[in-house]
Interface confidence: medium
């Protein structure tokens, strides 16, 4: 669908909070992957009954994707070839390059809690160095 993509300001820290904010974002933390391979970025919001209305995925200051409760997924045009939605609210990065190394943020917009932000650091290594076991997979 014709989705107007805004400029993105990456979030940092561990989220904001509503007056009853109890949730926490669980992420994979620091992960590594092979150059040319794929990786799943995954965050999980737990310990809250808040409704998730939207999840943004960003690489530092660039918007990668939006998963909106009403509209579904949108991938930013500049990442369409290498980013796939899911599984779930996660994001799959494909054809990794060394330039993909850096911070990634999941920003959960929830009601009534507010905004929760999770951080993942991805290091893309030459294939002989990457730790295969560091990849995160959804059970």
């Amino acid at each position: 669908y014709p989705y107007d993509v805004p400029d993105y300001a990456g979030g940092g820290g561990s989220g904001g909070g509503g007056s009853m904010m109890t949730g926490t974002i669980e992420t994979t933390g620091n992960i590594s992957a092979e150059k040319g391979g794929s990786i799943i970025l995954q965050c999980h919001l737990s310990s809250t009954t808040a409704q998730v209305t939207q999840v943004n995925w960003a690489q530092q200051d660039q918007l990668l994707a939006i998963c909106n409760a009403d509209l579904g997924w949108h991938i930013s045009p500049s990442f369409k070839d290498r980013v796939a939605p899911g599984p779930g609210l996660g994001l799959t990065l494909q054809s990794l390059t060394v330039n993909d190394t850096g911070e990634y943020f999941c920003i959960y917009h929830t009601y009534p809690d507010g905004t929760y932000t999770g951080r993942i650091f991805l290091e893309v290594l030459e294939s002989s160095v990457a730790e295969h076991g560091a990849r995160f997979q959804i059970p």
């Epitope: 943004n56 009403d70 009534p112």
Partner: antibody
Framework: EVQLVESGGGLVQPGGSLRLSCAAS????????MHWVRQAPGKGLEWVAF????????YYADTVKGRFTISRDNAKNSLYLQMNSLRAEDTAVYYC????????????WGQGTMVTVSS | DIQMTQSPSSLSASVGDRVTITCRAS??????LAWYQQKPGKAPKLLIY???TLQSGVPSRFSGSGSGTDFTLTISSLQPEDFATYYC?????????FGGGTKVEIK
Amino acid sequence: EVQLVESGGGLVQPGGSLRLSCAASGFTFSNFGMHWVRQAPGKGLEWVAFISSGSSSIYYADTVKGRFTISRDNAKNSLYLQMNSLRAEDTAVYYCARMRLDYYAMDYWGQGTMVTVSS
Amino acid sequence: DIQMTQSPSSLSASVGDRVTITCRASKSISKYLAWYQQKPGKAPKLLIYSGSTLQSGVPSRFSGSGSGTDFTLTISSLQPEDFATYYCQQHNEYPWTFGGGTKVEIK
């Protein structure tokens, strides 16, 4: 060019009702959450209500909950605010505003419509 | 609800001056703060969101900083068209709340 045009304001007696409309153009209305924000004469801004792009999420300020109803018709590119049981303190300019796709900041606003509640 | 407190409520400045407006939240809002400019009889205009990101089309003399509870809007060199009222708004949580405004007047 993004345009938001409010209408439906006017003078109403306490306890009365009004329905405000906001006509949107210049963007894909069905992709954006929308807000109503009001401003009493000589005062600051007060958020009133929000509706998500597909109407699945609707939130209200406590001051209007149970009296105001926000709705939208994506086929008509229109946003509405049904205001019932109006009080003098509801007197204000009412603005419709578009929500950014990524955050709950409001990137485009209409010119506003004045609602006066007085006997 | 989160209370947003702006200071000063008004200030007088001259063209070319550096102007700083502060906004304090009653609790942490991470970096999720927006700044708006409003001129008399007009609708507000978004200047900055997410604390420091300039809205498209806004002159670079406007900048925002801060996180947690304390935020600042800076106009590096005040221009004639910048005389207006400025509002902060937290967009971290429901209900979204605004500061009381800062009126920037000509000295």
